[in-house]
């Protein structure tokens, strides 16, 4: 799915219509780039409790298990993002897969992801003909990680 | 930084010039959306060996430590991506922070990230005027996770 751009536009770039109205399917086809989290959602029931499974996807086998929570915005590219939610405050023991080990903390790994929002173009709110894709950094939690607690100097 | 789009374009969308040439800064300002990994690169020296630190960023404090490796393509949005490279085959002991525990595997968590490539528009290679943004899914490793080894049924 391509977005066609003319070289040399002042707002990088400014665009022209070629038909009266863009069907909603077109925008959604382009914006719904990825509708799956890193690990298949079909398996995330494994990881809904504070235990490390011996099968299933990574997020349920991790000793810092997490579940995925959907974040959907139809005016954003990508339209669906997934946030990792840690299921345990501490890491689960490798031996048992269930008891928590206070020596380790289960913490979210955050990342500022590039996203694009569909917006009315500045100063053109009344025209209803143009829209802008505005680039933003959006904070998502990617996964939960088992770390040694920070020791302050 | 915005990309201005006219509603209703057949290729979602087709665009018009407003000046003769786009300066490189414009494209790169738009494409270099995120030039940092989830954890600051300035600290990644902590994570270059197979040990879990008691300070520094998450990737060095994790018992499945990793380093970040840059993936740069000036014709992609975002231009810079970072891949996590696991520094240990097994998880590091929470007690010592250095000895590996064979009960746990340190494995990369992969994700298909939405990216956009600047391309000549299909069938317009000779015009030198348009370019297209092509949406793709691009596989990146986000982090390394300590998991219990999979037990096959």
């Amino acid at each position: 799915v391509s977005l066609r751009i003319q070289e040399g536009c002042s707002h990088l770039p400014s665009c022209c219509p070629s038909k009266e109205q863009e069907p909603p399917e077109e925008w959604l086809k382009w914006s719904s780039a990825s509708v799956s989290p890193p690990e298949p959602l079909s398996h995330t029931h494994h990881a809904e409790s504070c235990r490390a499974s011996k099968d299933g996807p990574l997020n349920s086998r991790a000793i810092s298990p997490w579940s995925y929570e959907l974040d959907r915005d139809l005016n954003r590219v990508p339209q669906d993002l997934y946030h990792a939610r840690c299921l345990c405050p501490h890491c689960v023991s490798l031996q048992t897969g269930s008891h928590m080990d206070p020596l380790g903390n289960s913490v979210p790994l955050y990342h500022n992801q590039t996203v694009f929002y569909r917006r009315p173009c500045h100063g053109e709110e009344g025209t209803h003909r143009r829209y802008c894709l505005e680039r933003r950094l959006y904070r998502v939690s990617l996964a939960c990680v088992c770390v040694r607690p920070r020791v302050m100097a | 930084v915005s990309l201005r789009i006219q509603e209703g374009c057949s290729h979602l969308p087709s665009c018009c010039p407003s000046k003769e040439q786009e300066p490189p800064e414009e494209w790169l300002k738009w494409s270099s959306a995120s030039v940092s990994p989830p954890e600051p690169l300035s600290h990644t020296h902590h994570a270059e060996s197979c040990r879990a630190s008691k300070d520094g960023p998450l990737n060095s404090r994790a018992i499945s430590p990793w380093s970040y490796e840059l993936d740069r393509d000036l014709n992609r949005v975002p231009q810079d991506l970072y891949h996590a490279r696991c520094l240990c085959p097994h998880c590091v002991s929470l007690q010592t922070g250095s000895h590996m525990d064979p009960l746990g595997n340190s494995v990369p968590l992969y994700h298909n990230q939405t990216v956009f490539y600047r391309r000549p528009c299909h069938g317009e290679e000779g015009t030198h005027r348009r370019y297209c943004l092509e949406r793709r899914l691009y596989r990146v490793s986000l982090a390394c996770v300590c998991v219990r080894p999979r037990v096959m049924a």
């Epitope: - | 490539y117 290679e125 005027r129």
Partner: antibody, heavy 125, light 108 residues
Framework: QVTLRESGPALLKPTQTLTLTCTFS??????????LGWIRQPPGKALEWLAH???????HYKPALKSRLTISKDTSKNQVVLTITNVDPVDTATYYC?????????????????WGQGTLVTVSS | DIQLTQSPSFLSASVGDRVTITCSAS?????MYWYQQKPGKAPKPLIY???NLASGVPSRFSGSGSGTEYTLTISSMQPEDFATYYC???????????FGQGTKLEIK
Amino acid sequence: QVTLRESGPALLKPTQTLTLTCTFSGFSLSTSGMGLGWIRQPPGKALEWLAHIWWDDVKHYKPALKSRLTISKDTSKNQVVLTITNVDPVDTATYYCARMGQLHYYGYDYAMDYWGQGTLVTVSS
Amino acid sequence: DIQLTQSPSFLSASVGDRVTITCSASSSVSYMYWYQQKPGKAPKPLIYRTSNLASGVPSRFSGSGSGTEYTLTISSMQPEDFATYYCQLYHSYPPTWTFGQGTKLEIK
């Protein structure tokens, strides 16, 4: 007009450190998208890419040589310096610096569009 | 690392011949670049992005290909075309530039 010129010692002994300087004109290495690389060519052999530095000071190295290479830039002097530690006779080659950073309507090219004339470095005891 | 293999390594041709040089990548790549090098001189860019001619390059040179297979074609060899030709690619991760081993084009 774009020009690049390499300079450095013509002869070194094994284990010494090679320092090569590329002095350029006609473009600025602070321009977004601009980069400068080093390529070498042993006598009668193929081209081998060694290192690259971008306008924003991001550096890349050939993985097999990474531990021995350092690239740096001085934008105000229009110079890029490559150092190779612990040289060996197999490092005998003509060393070229070359520019990358041509923006077309379809994007950036990863070809080296301007090259220096090269400088021959011999490593011998 | 992606490897590039050029074939043939040596090629004898006559003026007026049509010549094709192939460059094979060990895994799929987006684009290929081509250079011409004459003895004692620096390489000169010939083809950008698989098929775009560099400035000042005669139209008898052309490039094509996709995926792992790329070709440089000289439609009618001229005396000044006898040289060594190199293919080159850029790989974004890890960021590396790779050259083929070269094809030496000699007069038959």
